[in-house]
């Protein structure tokens, strides 16, 4: 399996969590493995046990502290190692010099709520969770609305190129059920990626008033 394509990918949530995925093509791994994090300028180190998420991939979360604590900065380098047990010893499978603020993936936005809804419009707000104060306003969002008879994949993406934690959806159909999701991404970082999508928020537009031209 050493010649197979392997991947070791980790992301920092900007506060106190590094999530890692270790995958080995063609490998049936029945041994126990872990990720070990060793910062270059901190007194702590942390370990998490890799647990299977599919036949050839394993994941774990390095919990570095309280959820909103700022455990790493832009100057930190964390040496990440995948260690697997071979008999009585641990074998190093992978090593990476991980720069947390080059590998960001924030938590999904939370607390989605309908601020105001009309027949054709809906104003929705949300909050970001466990995001570093270092970003100030350097964040962007993507949003999508699920219309009846469509899938999420078909929903057009709305891009908000600034830290704007609300949106006004327009040209909606009266008396219609919709769902809405949003995700966030910092502008910083070579390997930074979008957060997961938020939990969907369901809402219904108001019915058109009878006898009125809408």
């Amino acid at each position: 399996a050493v010649n197979g394509t392997s991947q070791f990918t980790c992301f920092y949530n900007s506060r106190a969590n590094i999530s890692c995925v270790w995958s080995q093509d063609g490998a049936l791994q029945d041994t126990s493995c872990q990720v070990h994090a060793w910062p270059d300028r901190r007194r702590w180190n942390q370990t998490c046990e890799l647990l299977p998420v599919s036949q050839a991939s394993w994941a774990c979360n390095l919990i570095l502290g309280a959820p909103d604590s700022q455990k790493l900065t832009t100057v930190d380098i964390v040496t990440l190692r995948v260690l697997c047990r071979e008999g009585v010893r641990w074998r190093v499978m992978a090593i990476q010099d991980f720069k947390p603020f080059e590998n960001l993936r924030l938590m999904a936005p939370i607390s989605l709520q309908v601020v105001h809804v009309e027949t054709h419009r809906c104003n929705i707000s949300w909050e970001i969770s466990q995001a570093s104060h270092y970003f100030e306003r350097h964040l962007e969002f993507e949003a999508r609305t699920l219309s009846p008879g469509h899938t999420w994949e078909e929903a057009p993406l709305l891009t908000l190129k600034q830290k704007q934690e609300w949106i006004c959806l327009e040209t909606l159909t009266p008396d219609t059920q919709y769902e809405f999701q949003v995700r966030v991404k910092p502008l910083q970082g070579e390997f930074t990626t979008w957060s997961p999508w938020s939990q969907p928020l369901a809402f219904r537009t108001k019915p058109a008033a009878l006898g009125k031209d809408t």
Epitope: A1, V2, F8, I77, R91, M93, A94, I95, D97
Partner: nanobody
Amino acid sequence: QVQLVESGGGLAQAGGSLRLSCAASGRTFSQDAKAWFRQAPGKEREFVAAITWSGRDTDYADSVKGRFTIARDNAKNTVYLQMDSLKPEDTAVYYCAVYPQGTIGPYFRSSNHYDYWGQGTQVTVSS
């Protein structure tokens, strides 16, 4: 774009030494791993050694362990391969390569992981 230029190759006697250099220019990466591969005539390209961004961790093919040393100088954007106790079977074209995401280890020795390559430098070891 990334340019990688190898130098330092040449002819050496068995038991002798050579030091290869690979200078990178153009785009730089935040946490890349750099590696040396080699290809002998009629053979597939094979992994020689790799080094993490900080230079603190290295990985070597069994065939060169204890004889070759990989090092890097990020200020100069250069990676080195010190080759000692050379053997005729070390004869090959030596290539420098970059893996931007930066993981090294026994499961990351495939050339598929490496996105950027130099043109190579010839090393010939005579007996």
